[in-house]
């Protein structure tokens, strides 16, 4: 398997140069179109886990606790991405670690991560066929953050 | 420029097969060694910005506010990464948005992100020479999170 990185297989003939022909410089001008996760993953709030623990990993000690949900795509690099799912609508009190404080909102922090998709190269066949790698921006929620509610002017 | 993805240019002869020779399967077993940021960036706490605003972006509205520091490497994909720098040692009070609450710590959330480094392929020269892409895990701080201090057993 030989992998090449290119702009996108939308205009396939220029996607993968033949082994003899070296690709032009522009071949690396990657598209940066955004890709969304497979389906909108609802930010459901699980009351039973809406608490900030005093030990364990950072996502469970946070006053805006979250869990991680796996998003796997075998033709993407990286194959496994994790989306943060906020467990509470509001921030948990620092005092009790359980009661919610309506003064703070627990909100997801989004990030457009660079990922690559493996696509068969146009006209490539056989056991040693090459693949094109399409670069994309993929929206992931990294964590949940406790913020002061936005005040509208 | 033709980019190929491979295990790492530590054993360069197998890094970039000739145009005639199809790469062996192992050629894709990338190393996943962690890479540290260019220099240790100190977590200085800026008193003047240690406040949670009521508008603006999420990192300034958070009660664990942070700024972003650019880390640019032209031979890496992505070229630009941003490291979150916590602006306060403790979380800011939800009531005032300025006073710190010693019950909460503002801590960075670290993540090992997949990046690629462009390396010249061994023995490749001329205007159309190819490059190897080395896959690496690169530690970035994504955000700062307000957590309850860890209680030691």
């Amino acid at each position: 398997v030989s992998l090449r990185i290119q702009e996108g297989c939308s205009h396939l003939p220029s996607c993968c140069p033949s082994k003899e022909q070296e690709p032009p410089e522009e071949w690396l001008k990657w598209s940066s179109a955004s890709v969304s996760p497979p389906e909108p993953l609802s930010h459901t709030h699980h009351a039973e886990s809406c608490r900030a623990s005093k030990d364990g990993p950072l996502n469970s000690r946070a006053i805006s606790p979250w869990s991680y949900e796996l998003d796997r795509d075998l033709n993407r690099v990286p194959q496994d991405l994790y989306h943060a799912r906020c467990l509470c609508p509001h921030c948990v009190s620092l005092q009790t670690g359980s009661h919610m404080d309506p003064l703070g909102n627990s909100v997801p922090l989004y990030h457009n991560q660079t990922v690559f998709y493996r696509r068969p190269c146009h006209g490539e066949e056989g056991t040693h066929r090459r693949y094109c790698l399409e670069r994309r921006l993929y929206r992931v929620s990294l964590a949940c953050v406790c913020v002061r509610p936005r005040v509208m002017a | 420029v033709s980019l190929r993805i491979q295990e790492g240019c530590s054993h360069l002869p197998s890094c970039c097969p000739s145009k005639e020779q199809e790469p062996p399967e192992e050629w894709l077993k990338w190393s996943s060694a962690s890479v540290s940021p260019p220099e240790p960036l100190s977590h200085t706490h800026h008193a003047e910005s240690c406040r949670a605003s009521k508008d603006g972006p999420l990192n300034s509205r958070a009660i664990s506010p942070w700024s972003y520091e650019l880390d640019r490497d032209l031979n890496r994909v992505p070229q630009d990464l941003y490291h979150a720098r916590c602006l306060c040692p403790h979380c800011v009070s939800l009531q005032t948005g300025s006073h710190m609450d010693p019950l909460g710590n503002s801590v960075p959330l670290y993540h090992n992100q997949t990046v690629f480094y462009r390396r010249p392929c061994h023995g490749e020269e001329g205007t159309h020479r190819r490059y190897c892409l080395e896959r690496r895990l690169y530690r970035v701080s994504l955000a700062c999170v307000c957590v309850r201090p860890r209680v030691m057993a």
Epitope: R72, N75, Q79 | -
Partner: antibody, heavy 125, light 107 residues
Framework: QVQLVQSGAEVKKPGASVKVSCKAS????????MNWVRQAHGKNLEWMGL????????SHKQKFQGRVTMTVDKSISTAYMELSRLRSDDTAVYYC??????????????????WGQGTLVTVSS | DIQMTQSPSSLSASVGDRVTITCQAS??????LNWYQQKPDGTIKLLIY???TLHTGVPSRFSGSGSGTDYTLTISSLQPEDIATYYC?????????FGGGTKLEIK
């Protein structure tokens, strides 16, 4: 050698919860995802979900939404699967299975390469 | 979810026979298919991953083939210890799904 040892059989009443444990040994616990699969008597294998012990990340079959909780205790290399609001049709043998990854990185192939011995959970009033 | 249909649901064969079990996916799964063996005592073992690659320690009489939606597990010469139920499983997309199983008996 890789071993997954599960907790013993349980009898539960409808509406109760059950928590099955799976102790791993012979490999790096945090380096491999753990799957949970169940099998009602004489029936097909049914995938319930998986957990990454490194970050606690999970994925589960939609039908178990809100009823299944998968957790790990890294300090003792143990994975747990808790199923709540039990019904009689939850009577089954529950298996944990390590997920191995194979083939050229970064395009891995995944397979449940080592399985626990199974834990029979009986739900009966 | 991707549906996996296995056939036959049961079969009886003699020692030394060539045995074939088929598995059909409800959509193209790009060879992302595994085969498992469940012994009568409930023990489950991985036999084959990625359609045709034998897992460590699996006898060479087992082989797998197929592409697209249709896959096959073959035992070239049936042995008494092969008495078991065989399952296919797709890992093309979460949630993972298994076939209904094929119970293999010796005549």
């Amino acid at each position: 050698q890789v071993q997954l040892v599960q907790s013993g059989a349980e009898v539960k009443k409808p509406g109760a919860s059950v928590k099955v444990s799976c102790k791993a040994s012979g490999y790096s616990f945090t380096g491999y995802t753990m799957n949970w699969v169940r099998q009602a008597h004489g029936k097909n294998l049914e995938w319930m979900g998986l957990i990454n012990p490194d970050n606690g990340g999970t994925s589960h079959k939609q039908k178990f939404q809100g009823r299944v909780t998968m957790t790990v205790d890294k300090s003792i290399s143990t994975a747990y699967m808790e199923l709540s609001r039990l019904r009689s049709d939850d009577t089954a043998v529950y298996y944990c299975a390590r997920e191995g990854y194979y083939g050229p990185s970064p395009f891995h192939h995944y397979a449940m390469d080592y399985w626990g011995q199974g834990t029979l959970v009986t739900v009966s009033s | 979810d991707i549906q996996m249909t296995q056939s036959p649901s049961s079969l009886s064969a003699s020692v030394g026979d060539r045995v074939t079990i088929t598995c059909q996916a409800s959509q193209d799964i790009s060879n992302y298919l595994n085969w498992y063996q469940q012994k009568p005592d409930g023990t489950i073992k991985l036999l084959i991953y990625y359609t045709s690659t034998l897992h460590t320690g699996v006898p060479s009489r087992f082989s797998g083939s197929g592409s697209g939606t249709d896959y096959t597990l073959t035992i070239s010469s049936l042995q008494p210890e092969d008495i078991a139920t065989y399952y296919c499983q797709q890992y093309s997309k979460l949630p993972y799904t298994f076939g209904g199983g094929t119970k293999l008996e010796i005549k």
